[in-house]
Interface confidence: low
């Protein structure tokens, strides 16, 4: 290899060993018959040398600089030129470095073409190998500006009082050309302006200056960005840092085309603005810092352009004035993540803070509006907490559980509304009455309704859940010994139809000892399934829990258990079954740790159920399925 | 395979230095955050520095500032931390950790005793 | 500097039981998150990262969420080898990091 460099030419370059890998054999430069490990070639200077190994590529780099002086004499504006021409150079991975000084006066402006440059974070690569790092100068000290690979949307970098461009290139990229040039423009008065620019949808991830470290006390830093107008812009920070300032504030400033009130200033920790049309701005201004502890500011955002939804214009009002202890949170419905570009989808406060999850609570009115290509990507969950405090206040009380319509007026599906039913303890009890009987979800008779009620303890020690009900079945109420939460799940996009069937009443009652008891009602000729709470994980411990089952006069009952033996095997006390007929009182007693469950049997009148827990030892917990036919007395039952 | 492997623990006296290691194996400590964290006997977990090499990036705890240096040879593939001005308080078994979302590998510790 | 306010100190429960941690940062940390197992003698092992991201290998009965500035892990179904000391750690700032102080479940 020969490398000749020009006299005047203020270029550098250098050959020096890279990371090394481990490979047995070790390489050299070779001069004259002399093995060195790093060469140094100056302006003026002309050198042969070859390489001791096959592939040096493993085991050296080159750095080119170029000193490009603006203080003594006239620019070298215009296009950038590859000096020496890589065909001259060894393929070693290269690093070109053009290092700008200017006086504080002159600003400069690295123009990319197309590609456009995309910033990458701390511990992310490019693709092809191709980066270009960008640093720029406060007097003495170097800042950096960035890290970019191609194929973004960064087109122009201005700069003041010097810029330094490296270009990296992995020895196996033809690349022949900077990619960029240098035009001259008056002061910028700040570090630096980047310039992104979006032909269409699109997204990038930018950071301010010297990212993840701080940035620069008390500097002003610019983003320029141009969309077309009839695209829609929203920002979201991913992750900052305050500083602790002395003096003036930390803050994002957004220059919005149509604002009445530019500039529009915002803290980092605000949400920052969404559905913007067109071109803006976004300055980070730094402070004063603390001297004994600075902290850091840093910003790492991301810009998300998206053409606007038909939903972007219309603005929902939600009135929650007269709601109490509420909350409603729109969010993402969990799906799996995909590789390729995915639009936004964003909820909208005021038409401007838009976020991909907002929660608004009771009290307010809310005006909300969507942009969002597919609002199916979103639901709703929706919490009301309604509490008695004083027993004698909320004695015989009733309250509707009931979605609220403004709720179901909006355009994305509701997920869960939960009610959490809070009474002073041992004071009062609870009672849910349905408007149409509910069915207990099991396996055997499953719920295919487009909601369910799913019950269970809002004690947050205890792990009992009633279970799942949907309208359509035989249970005509619910009593529960204390706080529950009821949260009433929806299933399909139908249940805006099938909205009417909802319809919950809680009352409070005086307190009663037993967990829950269920009154069912069965209908005739339909079969009644029915199961213990916390199916699957076992009714908790010493736990008691019953059924008030109503026979008809013309009716008889037959009680099915579904298994020979109930399982459970109690550490410490009993679990055993009531079976008593309500006219009569006269009851049988099963202990459900020893004896085979009861064959079917009828009953003529209506009857008590109840069951009620041991201590049981850790896997062998006690879950009961049973179910209830009625059939006329006309039958013979012999 | 990933591993860490750290060394330089030992007993030394209240004022003492020692120089910890941690050997990375399996990947590249340039593209990682590699940290120190401690945990005194009967303790907690207690983060104590952390460097970036790619950007020369360091920061510590407020407990060590000044007197613990961490630094990186990429070309050892290992991360080091200089413990210098030792006090009892230090005593502790010295975890080194690498991270991306969050600490994934961590080596076995090193135990380091500071007592007179 | 954040911090992570672990609860509770201590646990005692059984093998099948459902456990649940929490852990509350004193600023918003977004979804940063990290929980850790570690066992007497050993090196902490990672759980779950980015509040609710089960790392590759450890059983789905652990899981994690996140409610604004509260984080939670939660054993579905208490296991023999899940007696340990588990940590939160906050990894919003890479300076300073900050863990939980930890809670050590023990067997009823």
């Known amino acids: 290899f020969e490398i000749a460099l020009p006299r005047e030419s203020n270029i550098t370059v250098l050959i020096k060993l890279g990371t090394p890998t481990l490979l047995a054999k070790p390489c050299y430069i070779v001069i004259s018959k002399r093995h060195i490990t790093m060469l140094s070639i100056k302006s003026g200077e002309r050198i042969v040398f070859t390489f001791s190994c096959q592939s040096p590529e493993n085991h050296f780099v080159i750095e080119i600089q170029k000193n490009i002086d603006c203080m003594s004499g006239p620019c070298p504006f215009g296009e950038v030129q590859l000096q020496p021409s890589t065909s001259l150079l060894p393929t070693l991975n290269r690093t070109f470095i053009w290092d700008v000084k200017a006086h504080k006066s002159i600003g400069l402006e690295l123009q990319f073409s197309i590609p456009r440059l995309r910033q990458i974070g701390p511990g992310e690569s490019c693709p092809d190998g191709v980066t270009h790092s960008i640093s720029g100068r406060i007097d003495a000290t170097v800042v950096r500006i960035g890290t970019f690979c191609s194929n973004g949307t960064v087109s122009r970098i201005k700069m003041q009082e010097g810029v330094k461009m490296a270009l990296h290139l992995p020895w196996f990229h033809p690349r022949n050309v900077s990619g960029f040039s240098i035009a001259n423009r008056s002061s910028i008065k700040r570090l630096c302006i980047i310039e992104s620019v979006f032909e269409g949808e699109g997204s990038a991830t930018l950071m301010s200056a010297n990212y993840p470290e701080g940035f620069p006390e008390d500097e002003l830093m610019t983003w320029q960005f141009v969309v077309p107008a009839h695209l829609r812009a929203s920002v979201s920070f991913l992750n900052f840092n305050l500083s602790n300032c002395e003096r003036k504030e930390e803050r994002v400033e957004y220059y919005i085309p149509g604002s009445t009130t530019n500039p529009e200033v915002f803290k980092l920790e605000d949400k920052q603005p969404g559905n913007m049309a067109g071109n803006f701005n976004l300055s980070l201004q730094g402070c004063d810092q603390d001297a004994q502890s600075p902290g850091i500011l840093r910003l790492q955002f991301q810009v998300l352009v998206q053409h606007p939804q038909n939903e972007s214009n219309k603005i929902y009002v939600v009135d929650l004035s007269n709601e109490r202890a509420m909350s409603l949170t729109i969010e993402p419905r969990p799906v799996k993540q995909s590789r390729k570009f995915v639009p936004g989808c964003f909820v909208c406060l005021e038409s401007r803070t838009c976020s991909s999850n907002l929660t608004l609570t009771s009290g307010s009115k809310h005006k909300i509006s969507f942009l969002c290509d597919d609002l199916t990507r979103l639901w709703m969950n929706v919490e009301k907490t309604i509490s008695c405090t004083d027993h004698r206040y909320c004695q015989r009380k009733s309250y509707s559980l009931q979605v609220p319509s403004d709720i179901l007026h909006l355009p994305v599906e509701l997920h869960d509304f939960s009610w959490k039913l809070l009474v002073p303890k041992d004071r009062l009890s609870l009672v849910l009455v349905p408007a149409q009987k509910l069915q207990q979800h099991t396996h055997e008779k499953p719920c295919n309704t487009s909601f369910s009620y799913l019950v269970a303890s809002a004690i947050p020690s205890q792990d009992l859940y009633f279970g799942s009900f949907c309208p359509g079945g035989s249970i005509k109420q619910i009593q529960v010994k204390q706080n529950i939460s009821v949260t009433l799940r929806t299933f399909a996009p139908s249940f805006q139809q099938e909205a009417s069937r909802q319809g919950l009443t809680v009352s409070f009652i005086p307190y009663f000892k037993e967990e829950g008891v269920f009154t069912v009602t069965p209908d005739t000729k339909s079969k009644v399934y029915l199961r213990t709470p916390n199916w699957d994980r076992g009714l908790p411990s010493l736990t008691s829990v019953s059924w008030n089952i109503s026979v008809p006069r013309d009716q008889v009952a037959c009680l099915t258990f579904f298994k020979e033996r109930s399982g459970v095997v109690c550490q410490t006390g009993r679990a055993f079954m009531i079976i008593q007929e309500q006219r009569t009182r006269a009851e049988e007693i099963f202990s459900l740790d020893e004896d085979v469950l009861p064959k079917p049997s009828f009953h003529h009148h209506s009857f008590w159920v109840n069951i009620s827990n041991c201590s049981p030892t850790s896997g062998k917990q006690l879950d009961l399925l049973f179910s209830v036919t009625l059939t006329p007395r006309t039958v013979d039952l012999t | 395979e990933v591993q860490l492997v750290e060394s330089g623990g030992g007993l030394v006296q209240p004022g003492g230095s020692l120089r910890l290691s941690c050997a990375a194996s399996?990947?590249?400590?340039?593209?990682?955050?590699m940290h120190w964290v401690r945990q005194a006997p009967g303790k907690g977990l207690e983060w104590v520095a952390s460097?970036?090499?790619?950007?020369?990036?360091?920061s510590y705890a407020d407990s060590v500032k000044g007197r613990f240096t961490i630094s990186a040879d990429t070309s050892k593939n290992t991360a080091y931390l200089q413990m210098n001005s030792l006090r009892a308080e230090d005593t502790a078994v010295y975890y080194c950790a690498r991270s991306y979302y969050a600490m994934d590998y961590w080596g076995q510790g090193t135990l380091v005793t500071v007592s007179s | 500097d954040i911090q992570m306010t672990q609860s509770p100190s201590s646990l005692s429960a059984s093998v099948g039981d459902r456990v649940t941690i929490t852990c509350r940062a004193s600023q918003s940390v977004s979804s940063a998150v990290a929980w850790y197992q570690q066992k007497p003698g050993k090196a902490p092992k990672l759980l779950i990262y980015s509040a609710s991201s089960l790392y590759s290998g450890v059983p789905s009965r652990f899981s994690g969420s996140r409610s604004g500035t509260d984080f939670t892990l939660t054993i579905s179904s208490l296991q023999p080898e899940d007696f340990a000391t588990y940590y939160c750690q906050q990894s919003y700032y890479v300076y300073p990091i900050t863990f939980g102080q930890g809670t050590k479940v023990e067997i009823k």
């Open positions: 460097i970036y090499s790619s950007s020369s990036y360091t």
């Open positions: 399996g990947f590249n400590i340039s593209y990682y955050y």
